[in-house]
Amino acid sequence: AKLGAVYTEGGFVEGVNKKLSLLGGDSVDIFKGIPFATAKTLENPQRHPGWQGTLKATNFKKRCLQATITQDNTYGQEDCLYLNIWVPQGRKQVSHNLPVMVWIYGGAFLMGSGQGANFLKNYLYDGEEIATRGNVIVVTFNYRVGPLGFLSTGDANLPGNFGLRDQHMAIAWVKRNIAAFGGDPDNITIFGESAGAASVSLQTLSPYNKGLIRRAISQSGMALSPWAIQKNPLFWAKTIAKKVGCPTEDTGKMAACLKITDPRALTLAYKLPVKKQEYPVVHYLAFIPVIDGDFIPDDPINLYNNTADIDYIAGINNMDGHLFATIDVPAVDKTKQTVTEEDFYRLVSGHTVAKGLKGAQATFDIYTESWAQDPSQENMKKTVVAFETDVLFLIPTEIALAQHKAHAKSAKTYSYLFSHPSRMPIYPKWMGADHADDLQYVFGKPFATPLGYRPQDRAVSKAMIAYWTNFARSGDPNMGNSPVPTHWYPYTLENGNYLDITKTITSASMKEHLREKFLKFWAVTFEVLPTVTGDQDTLTPPEDDSEVAPDPPSDDSQVVPVPPTDDSVEAQMPATIGF
């Protein structure tokens, strides 16, 4: 069976029907490049005006304008708000009332696209394997990133969160139109990784999505992650404005000027430092979501009532912090280089500025306890990775899981740890699962490109697709069309249950209290330490166009502009695990 032309609110669209075998039978309808919204520079997205005739939805559209990896050029385009749909089909009748899984890509809110990285037309976020193996509809889409997606003056002149609003527009489009493709508009699961996972979390917390989202999956990221909310957007807006020659004293004039500046210039005016800086690299993630008083009306920790009826899976990779550790402490990955106590202390203090000297010392002490017995470089390097993993991913995810569970009405809560080791040959032998290592398995790459993978990789992929799509279908990862290797029990506040995802998943893979000692440290010991306040006014970004990044505000978690009043009104916020 195949859909043919589908009538949407924008008009007719026609994709392609791809047979899954030479013998006929099952197939997948694929639609690429359906417009879901339009947007002007640094403005909220608007609904698309539609088209006449039949739109041929056969090619991915360009990604949203962003800097290249080298950060010296741009690619993509401003006209980028398009989505892609995969609909599995059986032999006879077209699919009807299928669960819908909407993917939100990661990339530090700075880069990425709905189709993902591409090697010889093999796109990372190709939804075919998930759709056909799990019998679900998969949707991917583009949203604005970098300054064009998240630049904010912290007030009504440039409220920011444009990229989040793009995401919302895509989810709302799916709600309104997916029935025409054979999807169930009342069974939408949003899922994402890294910045996409934090986006998933933020979308579930936003009042704008009331009634749109049934379930959610966050892979390595949460709204509570220290890198997910910019607490001092004006600082970074001024940095960009100076670079492109816009006034900075009046936010209204600054916003007006930025909106008519060449979008490529805005994009290139910001560079993420990839060489070691004074502070950990995540502090330089400038253009990320903000508490705007509207789309995100309050600190995320206060918005968990909005998730009471949204089933949630959240988890991390066991060495998610490795990617960040290699930038902050480059010796971590180099066998011939050593990590020193001083290196680690500098990293710790950079992540605990809100609590000053006492915070840094207490944190350093608990993380280096094992060093007395085992002062080996391997142990020290693993400590660095564990620390970054805890701070950036584990602790925020654990707090979020607890919040979700505590506020749940009908909602179910599940937790996982992805531990299938990285396949990167250049990594140390002690390496676990790095940040983003889970993506290839969720998207079924071991099946799509079998020559590049081992049987054990296919086992991991099969299990993840089964759990993920069962969850999308029923709200329970164990119940659905796909058999699973073991029963995944829900998360409880008492036991902190989680599924450890490895190449061999058995009943022993259900574990409890992940890194409980460290969780207690961050949530209790560290939390009660007195907060120190820095001086915002001493910060000066570099005048020239060099690679040197400005010092991030030292107390950037403490000072939150309260929209829609101007940025000079500052509300003191309690520290959330020190960020």
Epitope: G11, R47, P49, G50, Q52, G53, K175, R176
Partner: antibody
Framework: QVQLVQSGAEVKKPGASVKVSCKAS????????MHWVRQAPGQGLEWIGV????????SYAQKFKGRVTMTRDTSTSTVYMELSSLRSEDTAVYYC????????????WGQGTLVTVSS | DIQMTQSPSSLSASVGDRVTITCSAS?????LNWYQQKPGKAPKLLIY???SLPSGVPSRFSGSGSGTDFTLTISSLQPEDFATYYC????????FGQGTKLEIK
């Protein structure tokens, strides 16, 4: 100017089929979708479906799937709506209506065709 | 399908009155239009995209709203305005409100 001229009134017996035509003029026929909407006596408006005259693509309201067929003849700039297995509740005025622009409202309407289903 | 609920179902008013008709969608919608229909005639487009007037429609007609709640306002009723008004949402499965009959008081 845009004109949509529909065929005349029809009286049909239950179980029969009816085919209503709508001839378009004053614009490029293949450039705009054509919708069919009906209105039972004293009742509101009900969308039946839509056809793209360019390639013949159609979409029907769930309620009418399996009973309705929309076709077009580009040589005469005419669209047709055929409804089968008629029942008394199909008695209504049937309108063709052209899109105004883009994905837009129904900007131009035919004069309507009364279809009466009676034994 | 998205349900469209108009209120009131009917109302009586006098020439010169200001009249408001509301339309509520069962879920958030992108495209909302208003039509006027007189007895024995085809509907006529009055407002599109919630607030835009097609050429030839008098400026006393205005529309507003977004999301799920929309309003049609006639600022000063004229004799030719007595008719039935329908809201219409444009989605993959378009639907109409049940209509509001505007009668002379």
């Amino acid at each position: 100017q845009v004109q949509l001229v529909q065929s005349g009134a029809e009286v049909k017996k239950p179980g029969a089929s009816v085919k209503v035509s709508c001839k378009a003029s004053g614009y490029t026929f293949t450039s705009y979708n054509m919708h069919w909407v009906r209105q039972a006596p004293g009742q509101g408006l009900e969308w039946i479906g839509v056809i793209n005259p360019g390639d013949g693509a159609t979409s029907y309201a769930q309620k009418f799937k399996g009973r309705v067929t929309m076709t077009r003849d580009t040589s005469t700039s005419t669209v047709y709506m055929e409804l089968s297995s008629l029942r008394s509740e199909d008695t209504a005025v049937y309108y063709c209506a052209r899109d105004y622009y883009g994905s837009s409202p129904l900007g131009y309407w035919g004069q309507g065709t009364l279809v009466t289903v009676s034994s | 399908d998205i349900q469209m609920t108009q209120s009131p179902s009917s109302l009586s008013a006098s020439v010169g009155d200001r009249v408001t008709i509301t339309c509520s969608a069962s879920q958030s919608i992108s495209y909302l239009n208003w039509y006027q229909q007189k007895p024995g005639k085809a509907p006529k487009l009055l407002i599109y995209d919630a607030s835009s007037l097609p050429s030839g429609v008098p400026s006393r007609f205005s529309g507003s709203g977004s999301g799920t709640d929309f309003t049609l306002t006639i600022s000063s009723l004229q004799p030719e305005d007595f008719a039935t008004y329908y809201c219409h949402q444009r989605s993959s499965s378009p639907t109409f409100g049940q209509g509001t009959k505007l009668e002379i008081k």
